[in-house]
């Protein structure tokens, strides 16, 4: 596998993560955070090692920023668990809240 394919996967994975975060903001649906975290990581990791790497880098950066702004440790752990769930290839729908519109 070439460095360029890794880079391509990382770019696509970053885009998957961005789409998940953007959908999460748009949906603004109570109880959906874990689903979107899992979905972003799942989609990114499916791209390959580059995608999984990008997902990890982005979620770590996001966690650090949120921690800096006083995001609760409990919420942070729940988000992390959802991130790892998606990144390990498990079905993100496990965290899907009832009634969340199908477009997501």
């Amino acid at each position: 596998r070439s460095f360029f394919s890794f880079l391509g996967e990382a770019f696509d994975g970053a885009r998957d993560m961005w789409r998940a975060y953007s959908d999460m903001r748009e949906a603004n649906y109570i109880g959906s955070d874990k689903y979107f975290h899992a979905r972003g990581n799942y989609d990114a990791a499916k791209r390959g090692p580059g995608g999984a790497w990008a997902a990890e880098v982005i979620t770590d950066a996001r966690e650090n920023i949120q921690r800096f702004f006083g995001h609760g440790a409990e919420d942070s752990l729940a988000d992390q668990a959802a991130n790892e769930w998606g990144r390990s290839g498990k079905d993100p729908n496990h965290f899907r809240p009832a009634g969340l519109p199908e477009k997501y």
Partner: antibody
Framework: QVQLQQSGAELVRPGVSVKISCKGS????????MHWVKQSHAKSLEWIGV????????SYNQKFKGKATMTEDKSSSTVYMELARLTSEDSAIYYC??????????????WGQGTLVTVSA | DIQMTQSPASLSASVGETVTITCRAS??????LAWYQQKQGKSPQLLVY???TLAEGVPSRFSGSGSGTQFSLKINSLQPEDFGSYYC?????????FGTGTKLELK
């Protein structure tokens, strides 16, 4: 204690619709999703779908899309399920079951007593 | 959809015996499995969730085990009230699906 009280048995003609209800009590209604499950001799237990009692939005099993419509009334802590264009295949016992959370995926610790729907000409 | 297959479809046993019912998932569901008991004319009752966690009020003679695709429900020292039908159900992803059922009858 948690209780789910369902409406009574229905005998209906083919082609018409029927609306059954399930009233929750003994807990905070909007904290838990409400699911519907069909039990017939032919197919054992089948998950129809679930309604988010906070938003009133429903998620359906693909198989029951267009057949079942779920709604709720927060003021009376009641959920409803309407079954359209009934055929003999829809003759079954329908249960409401409270989810373990607001997620789609759940186990069911609390069930209604069931509503028997019989479709017959 | 995830298919849940139970075996046996029916079994006969006597009071005091130990029985095991198995449930197979068509794909990996990790430990996201529940078991229910249903008596004639009654609603199902939750026995076990997360494959091995006993629901509130369920006697300790019931025990669940397994993960991935293979699961089992064991009933030690059968009591007269244990006869009825048993169903497994996955709670991993959507749609939720139930097992084909096992009818436990008195020998």
């Amino acid at each position: 204690q948690v209780q789910l009280q369902q409406s009574g048995a229905e005998l209906v003609r083919p082609g018409v619709s029927v609306k059954i209800s399930c009233k929750g009590s003994g807990y905070t209604f909007t904290d838990y999703a409400m699911h519907w499950v069909k039990q017939s001799h032919a197919k054992s237990l089948e998950w129809i779908g679930v309604i988010n009692t906070y938003y009133g939005d429903a998620s359906y099993n693909q198989k029951f899309k267009g057949k079942a419509t779920m709604t709720e009334d927060k003021s009376s802590s009641t959920v409803y399920m309407e079954l359209a264009r009934l055929t003999s295949e829809d003759s079954a016992i329908y249960y409401c079951a409270r989810g373990s959370s607001i997620m789609i995926t759940s186990w069911f610790a609390y069930w209604g007593q069931g509503t028997l729907v019989t479709v017959s000409a | 959809d995830i298919q849940m297959t139970q075996s046996p479809a029916s079994l006969s046993a006597s009071v005091g015996e130990t029985v095991t019912i198995t449930c197979r998932a068509s794909e990996n569901i990790y430990s996201y499995l529940a078991w229910y008991q249903q008596k004639q004319g009654k609603s199902p009752q939750l026995l076990v969730y997360n494959a091995k966690t006993l629901a509130e009020g369920v006697p300790s003679r019931f025990s669940g085990s397994g993960s991935g695709t293979q699961f089992s429900l064991k009933i030690n020292s059968l009591q007269p009230e244990d006869f009825g039908s048993y169903y497994c159900q996955h709670h991993y992803g959507t749609p939720i699906t139930f097992g084909t059922g096992t009818k436990l009858e008195l020998k």
